[in-house]
Amino acid sequence: APTSSSTKKTQLQLEHLLLDLQMILNGINNYKNPKLTRMLTFKFYMPKKATELKHLQCLEEELKPLEEVLNLAQSKNFHLRPRDLISNINVIVLELKGSETTFMCEYADETATIVEFLNRWITFCQSIISTLT
């Protein structure tokens, strides 16, 4: 059956979010510098559950800490300045979850490194894209 235009739009937004998150992950993994060790000391909150678009609230709440860690890196590997990258992500997240959402994010007990955090949200996006296909 043909995919509805609203579903296609959601898929494209998720693809864009995925692209930005993978860019950050790639930039970190390519970062051959002692600062990587320091970046990995920063802890991020992980969602207890992330299976629906409303759960992107949990990602939104961690964008500021993410920007701070990326600023620390001062790397050209990110293709865009951290502020612009995070701004892009914020716009997409708001569009996907809806700005009227009153969802209260529940976080897991254990925190994660930036790499684990990014992997979690990339997996989330890919999973939703797959279910929409």
Partner: nanobody, 118 residues
Framework: EVQLLESGGGLVQPGGSLRLSCATS????????MGWYRQAPGKQRELVAV???????NYADSVKGRFTISRDNSKNTMYLQMNSLRAEDTAVYYC????????????WGQGTLVTVSS
Amino acid sequence: EVQLLESGGGLVQPGGSLRLSCATSGTIFSGYTMGWYRQAPGKQRELVAVISGGGDTNYADSVKGRFTISRDNSKNTMYLQMNSLRAEDTAVYYCYSREVTPPWKLYWGQGTLVTVSS
């Protein structure tokens, strides 16, 4: 290491056409998702078109009906046919290829400039 190289950009008049190509220096598995995004000065980066490993395509509303994305896995090349070009399509166009499973490798090119002006 895989590298992506875009070509086909240039100066074109409004209403004109261009075909961008994205060639890869190494093997990009047919299962990878590939796409094109563009960056205009002072504007948010825009994802223009995407093609999945299975050939499913998706387009930004701003280019729907005018742009067509395609890929030739045997040549490790992806294309973006751009018709009815407008001034607002002026930007640097980047191609990318990404893994859809961990470790989520992402590759992108250096970009090709498309200028639409009379």
